[in-house]
């Protein structure tokens, strides 16, 4: 069967969708790929919790899965001929969308070494137990299945879609229904974050009565890294309800006028944004969130902040503190690189000295230069070294081969050398289009 029921969770800059259906790993990846994503990564405990949430949502909708121990494909696979590496967290497996090897793993049991066939990873769910954040689904590896034969207990798969940013859900100040259509062709009425390029259809009214108005918005980038719908004020407002319906759709305070009209407001230390609904801190840097040598930088319109590090340092995983950058990893030096706090130092090998074109360059030391030659007679400079020679009738001698000694002729002959919606996938991209547009055969344009 194909992929059926789906659930969706959007958080940060990614959305996860869970699908039921007995598909092979390749068919599941193709399904995710068609909509601009990949089988999901589980690169951290936090990501494992997001994936667990979307699976829990799917299981609430799905009436009955056939197996007590159900498996859902994720995007971790090992190609045929690539062997198990027990020393690595991913054991030699890699994420289908590419990306770095990550330290997080949650294997179900010790893996058997088998290089003769491709192996794929699924999440193992014990449906007899409730899904708890403390009990994250284990990783189970096995055959990748084939069309019509997905593998034992395979009940579905999880996709991941990455975005430039997300919009807040639209605020309704009165009765109505919002339907979001995402770029990965999922429709939902309840998303805690709505991905860039999603469309929102708002139908105002009580439902059974005639709808009074409808609105259409797109989640777009309004300014650099500022994602918004472009709607102004709460939607579907009704004098009948005033602030009593969903706090008037206001983020913080709702103020009613005598005629049933109302305005949104903000608590002290906050200000109302252009959408006339949302409140943002007047200065998120005032609480000094950045630590160590990090400086707090306000985002546009004072909406958010980012910590910034001095040169030679970078933000740690908390994004609040600075750690030294190992500049030597980028090989900035021609020869030897020594990492130092906040910087680095280039050094040259024996036989070389600092100099030449470019930063960190080394040039050959001319050991044969006048007054410097270590040779008793002839001296020839070479790259990084030198060699001595002797006049006719003499041969090189001495432990270091710099001296010349006479040849006894009576004894006989002594004898180295790469030149605007968009989804993001590793190594490629997939172009996507806004609702109402279709991807052209060239895979780039929208028509």
């Amino acid at each position: 069967t194909g992929a059926d029921t789906e659930a969706v969770v959007c958080v940060g800059t990614a959305c996860y969708t869970a699908h039921s259906g007995k598909l092979s790993a390749a068919e599941a990846q193709n399904h995710c790929n068609q909509n601009g994503g990949n089988l999901a990564t589980v690169k951290s405990k936090e990501e494992a919790q997001h994936v667990q949430r979307v699976l829990a949502q799917l299981l609430r909708r799905e009436a009955a899965l056939t197996a007590r121990m159900s498996k859902f494909w994720i995007g971790l696979q090992r190609e045929k001929g690539k062997c198990l590496d027990p020393s690595l967290p991913l054991k030699g497996f890699s994420w289908v969308g590419g990306g770095e090897d990550t330290p997080y793993s949650n294997w179900h049991k010790e893996l058997r070494n088998s290089c003769i066939s491709k192996r794929c990873v699924s999440l193992l769910l014990d449906l007899s137990q409730p899904l708890l954040p403390s009990r994250l689904p284990k990783w189970s590896e096995g055959p990748c299945g084939s069309p019509g034969s997905p593998g034992s207990n395979i009940e579905g798969f999880v996709c991941k879609f990455s975005f430039k940013g997300m919009c807040r859900p639209l605020a309704l100040g009165g009765p109505g229904q919002v339907t979001y259509t995402t770029p990965f062709q999922t429709t939902s009425s309840s998303l805690e974050a709505v991905p860039f390029a999603s469309a929102a259809n708002v139908a105002c009214g009580e439902g059974d009565k005639d709808e009074t108005q409808s609105h259409y918005f797109l989640c777009k980038e309004k300014a650099p890294d500022v994602f918004d719908w472009g709607s102004s004020g709460p939607l579907c407002v009704s004098p009948k309800y005033g602030c009593n319906f969903n706090n008037g759709g206001c983020h913080q305070d709702c103020f009613e006028g005598g005629d049933g009209s109302f305005l949104c407001g903000c608590r002290p230390g906050f200000r109302l944004l252009d959408d006339l609904v949302t409140c943002a801190s007047r200065n998120p840097c005032s609480s000094s969130p950045c630590r160590g040598g990090a400086t707090c930088v306000l985002g546009p319109h004072g909406k958010n902040y980012t910590c910034r590090c001095p040169q030679g340092y970078q933000l740690d995983s908390s994004q609040l503190d600075c750690v030294d950058v190992d500049e030597c990893q980028d090989s900035p030096c021609a020869q030897e690189c020594v990492n130092t706090p906040g910087g680095f130092r280039c050094e040259c090998w024996v036989g070389y000295e600092p100099g030449g074109p470019g930063e960190g360059a080394c040039q050959d030391v001319d050991e044969c230069a006048l007054g410097r030659s270590p040779c008793a007679q002839g001296c020839t400079n070479t790259d990084g070294s030198f060699h001595c020679s002797c006049e006719e009738g003499y041969v090189l001698a001495g432990e270091d081969g710099t001296q010349c000694q006479d040849v006894d002729e009576c004894v006989g002959p002594g004898g180295p050398l790469c030149d605007s919606l968009c989804f993001n996938t590793q190594g490629s991209f997939h172009c996507g289009c806004l609702p109402g547009w279709v991807l052209a055969p060239n895979g780039v344009s929208c028509t």
Epitope: F217, L218, K220, V297, L298
Partner: antibody
């Protein structure tokens, strides 16, 4: 290739309105912001608004708010700029300009000269 | 609104010489994402402006590499390393960090 073709020059009386069109081709019209910029004779450039044709979302320079209306017709990939209550200082060349993914104004229309004179 | 001051108003440089145009903003254009939203445009007589440099230092498609952009959060420079006759134009800096987008007053570049 991307092209923005604007309507012809206009001569208007003070107090009247003018509507300039900008027909886009060669790209997904609905997916890019379309900006309007004007340039008075011998003067610099002044941004006065933009529209996102996908959903009609608009932003205006506060200096012109209330006098300018931006609209877009997705079916013909055409954007319109209407400026009302014209005065002599509105005499300028009006450009429509596409905003790209890097927030640059990458493609410009040829410009429409609007002359306001009694 | 973010205000900008472009200098000089006009500039005369000999062919083959270096030309430098400056732009100063009332607020840092460095976004918390590390990108500086500063742009340079070139306008020749009777033509619409043309994008030269985006995000402070990136050359737009088809722009000769004698053009370069540099700067910090508030102070920026457009440099033409070796002036050519076809570079005679008015140059504008602009910011696209915060609405309303704003332009500098322009610098008229001529040949000495």
């Amino acid at each position: 290739q991307v092209q923005l073709v604007q309507s012809g020059a206009e001569v208007k009386k003070p107090g009247s309105s003018v509507k300039v069109s900008c027909k886009a081709s060669g790209y997904a019209f609905s997916s890019y912001w379309l900006n309007w910029v004007r340039q008075a004779p011998g003067q610099g450039l002044e941004w006065f608004g933009r529209i996102y044709p996908g959903d009609g979302d608009t932003d205006y320079n506060g200096k012109f708010k209330g006098r300018v209306t931006l609209t877009a017709d997705k079916s013909t990939s055409t954007a319109y700029m209407e400026l009302s209550s014209l005065r002599s200082e509105d005499t300028a060349v009006y450009f429509c300009v596409r905003g790209d993914g890097y927030w640059a104004m990458d493609y410009w229309g040829q410009g429409t000269t609007v002359t306001v004179s009694s | 609104d973010i205000v900008m001051t472009q200098s000089p108003d006009s500039l005369a440089v000999s062919l083959g010489e270096r030309a430098t145009i400056n732009c100063r903003f009332s607020k840092s254009l460095l976004h918390s994402n590390g990108i500086t939203y500063l742009y340079w445009y070139q306008q020749k007589p009777g033509q619409p402006p043309k994008l030269l440099i985006y995000q402070m230092s990136n050359l737009a498609s088809g722009v000769p590499d004698r053009f370069s952009g540099s700067g910090s959060g508030t102070d920026f420079t457009l440099t033409i390393s070796s002036l050519q006759a076809e570079d005679v134009a008015v140059y504008y800096c602009a910011q696209n960090l915060e609405l309303p987008w704003t332009f500098g007053g322009g610098t008229k570049l001529e040949i000495k």
